[in-house]
């Protein structure tokens, strides 16, 4: 999925939270050097997803996917690509 | 780099009011079941998390956005 290419660690953390997978959340948080209080905070968010069940996780995942693939984001990605191409061309 | 629309969604989830967050979600997915779910999750997070927790969650997000993996 294109959205994960823009900031893979964000989507790793988001889907670990939303899926209720504490182990994957811990691993993802290690990758960004999260402190213990930061881990505790993220696990409180995770608890909300777990308590509200599978449908809740699916629906919120759908929202995140929809936002990430919206014209607001895809337009941004295209614009960034254009800017990168301009810079690369100028750099030659 | 993270898309600003995603960043806004996450920021409102943590720091906005339930109405502000649901309004933001509605711009992208206006299904009643989705909006009800968004409100339930937002209310849960507000009930569970102290202001300090929210600051810590925002700190994690900052680490994510500035990570080489983003």
């Amino acid at each position: 999925v294109k959205m994960a290419e823009t900031c893979p660690i964000f989507y790793d953390v988001f889907f670990a939270v939303a899926n209720g997978n504490e182990l994957l959340l811990d691993l993802s948080l290690t990758k960004v050097n999260a402190t213990e209080p930061e881990r505790t905070a993220m696990k409180k968010i995770q608890d909300c997803y777990v308590e509200n069940g599978l449908i809740s996780r699916v629906l919120d995942g759908l929202v995140m996917t929809t936002i990430s693939s919206s014209k607001d984001c895809m337009g941004e990605a295209v614009q960034n690509t254009v800017e990168d191409l301009k810079l690369n061309t100028l750099g030659r | 780099e993270i898309c600003p629309a995603v960043k806004r969604d996450v920021d409102l989830f943590l720091t906005g009011t339930p109405d502000e967050y649901v309004e933001q979600v509605a711009q992208y997915k206006a299904l009643p079941v989705v909006l009800e779910n968004a409100r339930i999750l937002k209310n849960c997070v507000d009930a569970k998390m102290t202001e300090e927790d929210k600051e810590n969650a925002l700190s994690v997000l900052d680490k994510i956005y500035t990570s080489p993996l983003c």
């Epitope: 997978n21 504490e22 182990l23 811990d26 691993l27 290690t30 213990e36 | 993996l69």
Partner: antibody
Framework: EVELLESGGGLVQPGGSLRLSCAAS????????MSWVRQAPGKGLEWVSS????????HFADSVKGRFTFSRDNSKNTLYLQLSSLRAEDTAVYYC???????????WGQGTLVTVSS | DIQMTQSPSSLSASVGDRVTITCQAN??????LNWYQQRPGKAPNLLIY???NLETGVPSRFSGSGSGTDFTFTISSLQPEDIATYYC?????????FGPGTKVDIK
């Protein structure tokens, strides 16, 4: 001082079952993910499984998936690895290890030997 | 699954020598790599985490470097107690895998 003490190893026939335990002390057990790593005689290290601290999310190596189960009792500071449908290639020393941040095995037990043979 | 390779598989060096071991991943793992020492008949011991961070209590003669797919572990001045097998391990994602190990002994 952090201590991890494995038990439950022994000789078992192919197809048989065994339950390994790991008693932990010297740290806040529920705050840490934990793992099992095994080492076949004369061979290298192989990660087997990890479990998260509070809710017990687990991941397994493909080689043991569907045959091993990993659980923890935070009230007893104890881990359990249930081994079933055992094969000769499961013969190894099984180490339990503390997994800091679910990523670094920073403390290890002394290991318990599991031998699968007829 | 990510494969880890190590070289050499074994080496002999004199006390005081600088010893270097390399570890290679078959895909980019950023700096998500640890190094362990296992002395004969003992459990492994964490030396280096996140490619270059020295674990608390580990002598400063041990160091690690690298990022992406290529990593290096160095003992700046080999001591008799460093006789052991050294393993790298990635934590990019599950399943975690270890390198096959490098056996170090004294000439």
């Amino acid at each position: 001082e952090v201590e991890l003490l494995e038990s439950g190893g022994g000789l078992v026939q192919p197809g048989g079952s065994l339950r390994l335990s790991c008693a932990a002390s010297g740290f806040t057990f529920s705050s840490y993910a934990m793992s099992w790593v095994r080492q076949a005689p004369g061979k290298g290290l192989e990660w087997v499984s990890s479990i998260s601290g509070r809710v017990g999310s687990t991941h397994f190596a493909d080689s043991v998936k569907g045959r091993f189960t990993f659980s923890r009792d935070n009230s007893k500071n104890t881990l359990y690895l249930q081994l079933s449908s055992l094969r000769a290639e499961d013969t190894a020393v099984y180490y339990c290890a503390r997994s800091r941040g679910a990523a670094y095995f920073d403390y290890w037990g002394q290991g318990t030997l599991v031998t699968v043979s007829s | 699954d990510i494969q880890m390779t190590q070289s050499p598989s074994s080496l002999s060096a004199s006390v005081g020598d600088r010893v270097t071991i390399t570890c290679q991943a078959n895909q980019d793992i950023s700096n998500f790599l640890n190094w362990y020492q296992q002395r004969p008949g003992k459990a492994p011991n964490l030396l280096i985490y996140a490619a270059s961070n020295l674990e608390t209590g580990v002598p400063s003669r041990f160091s690690g470097s690298g990022s992406g797919t290529d990593f290096t572990f160095t003992i700046s001045s080999l001591q008799p107690e460093d006789i052991a097998t050294y393993y790298c391990q990635h934590y990019d994602n599950f399943p975690f895998t270890f390198g096959p190990g490098t056996k170090v002994d004294i000439k």
